[in-house]
Interface confidence: low
């Protein structure tokens, strides 16, 4: 049929709580295209009636929730005016109990993570949330054993817990918890993260701290022009690498061929007990692929997001 | 530094609806909580809700069915709707926000309030 | 919703005085916050997390407690510190405020 076929790792998922794959795939999906879910080689496409529990989003494929059934290969069809591309996406649904059976505590875990926090540093675990624009979370709540987190040590921000002064003790199993909304519909989100404690410090041995992005969302038309800056903290002699990425990528390298999205030139300030750097992000054109992918800035081993949304439509306009 | 202003008429009838206006200069309303918070005349502040960065709002369950609060991010700016007054809404109305340099539930940063009175 | 009661509700004190505002709950609390207001004034955020004071509170001010039972402490009164004084739980929703407590000059 023509179609390059891309196959992605395998998700690991857990039963009864929402779950959101977006079919982005840049350089592809760059230019004028269409995307298409399937399931399993099925000729009809997934549903993008919202009422539906499996939909398609935009480019997204919306489970809410995930039931045992879903498990299977699942086929995002990226078709552009020259161009097909097929990505493979497999699925595993399984039932995770975090806590014990017998006690009564969190429900099920989804995707599980692994994150590091350094030890006698002030560090952050992050809660990986990646939904469409249609799906609206509220705050997060942070366990650890089954028990949700408290202590001075401890502050939840947006999608981040914040540890301060990182100790032995606090290695082990910890989730964050969140209600999704989506069409006036409640939904509970629930990720675990296996943390480890290592006593290595990323590159210089001091953790940045990023005073800008906030993993936050910022909104801007399609087509226009837009530079983000990233402002990261960090001690006069670091050695740490300061940088963006998307998909893990840095965006140099992304978007080589076409040099639609580049990182620009690293400037600094110096403080007195401390330099103020600055390293931005620059969209010469904004595509409708960019919105709701989170564009990383990473300083040694702290890292933020932005994502770009577009804005609500101004009605007073009609 | 951040800064909040609220706004909106001083006077609403009874039955009517209140609505308020907080503009807000400094920070960005797509990160953290967006607050409103009343002072009845000699009396103490009640929570009335928020607004958080992702659009989630959370309203006090005494005024739930009656209290809307939204926003508009490219003006910065959000919202608070109170339907159905009568004189037991009366009180000065503030807006605020945490910080960074605070945990997000401090209330850091507070407008100047505006006083509604609701009379006829 | 959790109930918080301040007591005393009004307090007359010279200046140089040791002050005490203690804050119930009626169900456990993980942190509480205080507020300062002055007539005709915002509240001003003057303790966070139960001990830890906000930019260009003096340090005679002091937080505790844990649970249900925490404290505020001014251990010398200055003419600035009369206000009334708000206590605030953010752990369960609806997020409270105390009643308050009028601090006054005797």
């Known amino acids: 049929d023509g179609c390059n076929d891309i196959f992605m790792k395998n998700e690991m998922l857990s039963a009864s709580q929402p779950f959101a794959f977006n079919c982005t795939f840049p350089p592809i999906t760059s230019g004028e295209v269409s995307v298409t879910w399937y399931k399993n080689s099925s000729k009809i496409p997934v549903s993008k009636i919202i009422q539906s529990r499996i939909h398609q989003d935009e480019t997204w494929i919306l489970f809410l929730p995930m039931e045992w059934g879903d498990s299977g290969v699942y086929q995002c069809v990226i078709k552009g005016r020259d161009s097909c591309h097929r990505i493979h996406v497999n699925l595993t649904v399984f039932e995770k109990q975090w806590c014990d059976t017998s006690v009564k505590g969190l429900p099920n875990l989804s995707d599980e993570y692994k994150q590091i926090l350094h030890l006698g540093k002030d560090d952050s675990l992050t809660c990986h949330l990646h939904f469409p624009k249609s799906c609206i979370l509220g705050p997060i709540k942070w366990y650890k054993d089954c028990n949700e987190i408290t202590g001075e040590r401890f502050t939840v921000l947006e999608t981040r817990l914040l540890v301060s002064n990182v100790s032995a003790e606090d290695r082990g199993n910890y989730a964050c918890q969140v209600i999704l909304t989506h069409s006036g519909k409640q939904y509970e989100v629930l990720n675990g993260i296996t943390v480890s404690i290592t006593e290595r410090a990323g590159y210089g041995g001091s953790v940045p701290k990023i005073i800008y992005p906030k993993n936050n969302s910022i909104e801007v038309q399609l087509g226009t022009t837009l530079i983000v800056d990233c402002n990261i903290t960090d001690t006069k002699d670091n050695t740490n690498l300061r940088c963006w990425r998307v998909n893990n990528t840095l965006v140099d390298d992304y978007y080589n061929e076409s040099k639609r999205i580049r990182e620009g030139v690293e400037t600094h300030a110096s403080f007195r007990e401390y330099n103020l750097y600055t390293v931005n992000i620059t969209f010469l054109e904004v595509k409708m692929e960019d919105y709701g992918l989170p564009f990383m800035c990473h300083a040694g081993v702290s890292a933020a997001y932005i994502m770009l949304q577009l804005p609500a439509p101004d009605f007073r306009a009609y | 530094q951040v800064q909040l202003q609220e706004s909106g008429p001083g006077l609403v009838k009874p039955s009517q609806t209140l609505s308020l206006t907080c503009t807000v200069s400094?920070?960005?309303?797509?990160?953290g909580y967006w607050n409103w918070i009343r002072n009845h005349p000699g009396k103490g502040l009640e929570y009335i809700?928020?607004?958080?960065?992702?659009?989630?709002?959370y309203y006090n369950p005494s005024l739930k069915s009656r209290v809307t609060i939204s926003r508009d991010t490219s003006k910065n700016q959000y919202y608070l709707k109170l339907s159905s007054v009568t004189a037991a809404d009366t009180a000065v109305y503030y807006c605020?926000?945490?910080?960074?340099?605070?945990?997000?539930?401090?209330?850091?940063?507070w407008g100047q309030g505006t006083l509604v009175t609701v009379s006829s | 919703d959790i109930q918080m009661t301040q007591s005393p509700s009004s307090l007359s004190a010279s200046v140089g005085d040791r002050v005490t505002i203690t804050c119930r709950a009626s169900?456990?609390?993980?942190?509480m916050y205080w507020y300062q207001q002055k007539p005709g004034k915002a509240p001003k955020l003057w303790i966070y997390?139960?001990?830890n004071l906000a930019s260009g509170v003096p340090s005679r001010f002091s937080g505790s407690g844990s649970g249900t039972s925490y404290t505020l402490t001014i251990s010398s009164l200055q003419p600035e510190d009369f206000a009334t004084y708000y206590c605030?739980?953010?752990?369960?929703?609806?997020?409270?405020f105390g009643q308050g407590t009028k601090l006054e000059i005797k």
């Open positions: 605020a926000t945490g910080g960074y340099d605070y945990v997000e539930d401090a209330l850091y940063y």
């Open positions: 400094g920070a960005s309303i797509t990160s």
């Open positions: 809700g928020y607004i958080y960065y992702s659009g989630y709002t």
């Open positions: 169900s456990n609390v993980r942190y």
């Open positions: 997390l139960t001990s």
């Open positions: 605030q739980q953010f752990t369960t929703s609806p997020y409270t």
